[in-house]
């Protein structure tokens, strides 16, 4: 998997007027890294991950940096021509990465109201946008805006691209990329589903990183996909990762499946505990 | 007496169909998954089809996914393989064989039937 | 699709001998391989399930081994009813046979 750096900052106008203020988060190799406004750039990650790695580091030129990138962001918003009444948002999102062979891959992509409008290769400088009348006048104005400001297209726009990887190979060199494995924690629970059928659901939690394999097996077979439901891989807020998997089974067959979890390499399976069902849910509707 | 047995098999043109049946008994059939493996003259054993003990998980092998349906009727015990788009390369001994459901199997086949033969040839 | 090399293909040995069949797969199959013993005009028979485990029934001079990509069948001494070919299976990803070693009379 590629290192990457994720910049997300928003700004807000309301009744066509640009608000002051400005939010920038910022995710390392897909975690919660930083979360800046125009005051100051905070560590994001909780727990022990964001302690160990972080240390007690000052942001000052993450706050700098990221503070001026606020302002044109605000300058872009203002040019919009499309500013109705009520509360309105334009996102820019950058992303920069460093892959194993060392090729890298670096894109912009803007949003107004959380709808995308425009997005730009930072390596070709090729700029694509969605088909739909709104995204291509939004897209029209913004372009024109950053040609009409060349000197800002040439020091910010253009250097973005090596700005976002030389900050990603800075954070690299520093050790703040760690390539930890926190293995999962694995528990299976069973629920009544209806006559003679339960369901059984098995959890990871506080795994890193986010790449695991879970699923159902019955007599060591994999049961197909169709047959098992899953939830997203979401953070849990500890700069770590969950998932479940949850399938239907005959009342009474529980000692004939396990749930198998893959993850960094190491694997395990795990029973259904027998016994009374103690929760009265199902994850199936 | 736990035993399988296969019936079904004989000679086929290439380009017809046939159809393979297994006969379970001495164990509650539907508790079991099943599968098809077959065995060319003088050849190795080929996996061929596998179905869960409710019908709700079913894989097959590339050389015959396609072309043959496995499928099983729990309240007669019984096993079955549609074959359609017989080729000469299909002619081999044909087992049905259960899925083992001893705590921690890793999907191994403990009783197996002895096999019927099936010949595409013009 | 997972493919499993079986080496020997074959293999001569005499009453009394210690036997390793080898078995590799193209990737980590974790513990997910079993071994089964054929004789001419027979059904393959369960040896050892779960790479190591050893079936019911089944003399305790078989032994199955290893984990990932690399398995061995062990028979620690030939009887004259062992001469016969195996197979190793894997059910990590679908279900596939190795090619078979065939054990003969030295």
């Known amino acids: 998997e590629p290192h990457s750096l994720r910049y997300n900052l928003t700004v807000l106008s309301w009744d066509g007027s640009v608000q002051s203020g400005f939010l920038t988060e910022v995710h390392l190799d897909g975690q919660p890294f930083l979360r800046c406004d125009r005051q100051k750039c905070r560590a994001k990650p909780q727990g022990q991950w964001a302690e160990d790695v972080l240390g007690n580091k000052t942001w000052d030129r993450e706050t700098r940096d990221l503070t001026g990138n606020g302002k044109d962001l605000r300058m872009t918003l203002a040019h919009i021509k499309d500013q109705k009444e009520g509360l309105h948002s334009l996102q820019e999102i950058r992303v920069c990465e460093i892959h194993e062979d060392n090729s890298t891959r670096s894109s912009q992509h803007f949003y107004y109201d959380g709808e995308l409008f425009l997005s730009q290769n930072l390596e070709t400088k090729e700029w694509t946008m969605p088909q739909s009348s709104r995204a291509q006048t939004l897209a029209m104005n913004v372009r024109n805006f950053l040609k009409e400001d060349a000197m800002k297209t040439k020091t910010h726009y253009h250097a973005m691209h090596a700005d976002c990887l030389q900050e990603l190979r800075r954070y690299l060199k520093s050790g703040v990329v760690l390539r930890r494995t926190v293995p999962p924690m694995v528990n299976v629970t069973r629920s009544e589903a209806s006559e003679g059928n339960i369901t059984v659901t098995c959890r990871a939690s506080g795994f890193y990183p986010w790449n695991i394999t879970l699923s159902w097996r019955q007599d060591g077979v994999s049961l197909s996909h169709d047959t098992q439901q899953w939830g997203d891989v979401l953070p849990d807020g500890n700069g770590t990762y969950q998932t479940w998997v949850a399938t239907r089974i005959c009342q009474g067959e529980e000692q004939r499946f396990t749930c198998y979890m893959e993850h960094s390499g190491n694997h395990s399976t795990h029973p259904v505990p027998s016994g009374k069902v103690l929760v009265l849910q199902s994850h199936w509707q | 007496q736990v035993q399988l047995q296969e019936s079904g098999g004989g000679l086929v043109q290439p380009g017809g169909s046939m159809r393979l049946s297994c006969g379970a008994s001495?164990?509650?059939?539907?508790?079991?998954?099943m599968n098809w493996v077959r065995q060319a003259p003088g050849k190795g054993l080929e996996w061929l089809s596998y179905?869960?003990?409710?019908?709700?998980?079913?894989y097959y092998a590339d050389s015959v996914k396609g072309r043959f349906t496995i499928s099983r009727d729990n309240a007669k015990n019984s096993l079955n393989l549609q074959m359609h788009s017989l080729r000469d390369e299909d002619t081999a001994v044909y087992y049905c064989?259960?899925?083992?459901?001893?705590?921690?199997?890793?999907?191994?086949?403990?009783?197996w039937g002895q096999g019927t033969t099936v010949t595409v040839s013009s | 699709e997972i493919v499993l090399t079986q080496s020997p293909s074959s293999l001569s040995a005499s009453v009394g001998d210690r036997v390793t069949i080898t078995c590799r797969a193209s990737?980590?199959?974790?513990?997910?391989l079993n071994w089964y013993q054929q004789k001419p005009g027979k059904a393959p028979k369960l040896l050892i399930y779960?790479?190591?485990s050893l079936q019911s029934g089944v003399p305790s001079r078989f032994s199955g081994s290893g984990s990932g990509t690399d398995f061995t069948l062990t028979i620690s001494s030939l009887q004259p009813e062992d001469f016969a070919t195996y197979y190793c299976?894997?059910?990590?990803?679908?279900?596939?046979f190795g090619g078979g070693t065939k054990l003969e009379i030295k």
């Open positions: 064989a259960r899925v083992s459901d001893i705590t921690g199997n890793t999907g191994s086949f403990d009783i």
């Open positions: 001495g164990f509650t059939f539907s508790r079991y998954s």
């Open positions: 179905i869960s003990s409710r019908s709700s998980t079913i």
């Open positions: 990737q980590s199959i974790h513990n997910y």
């Open positions: 779960a790479a190591s």
């Open positions: 299976q894997q059910s990590y990803s679908t279900l596939t």
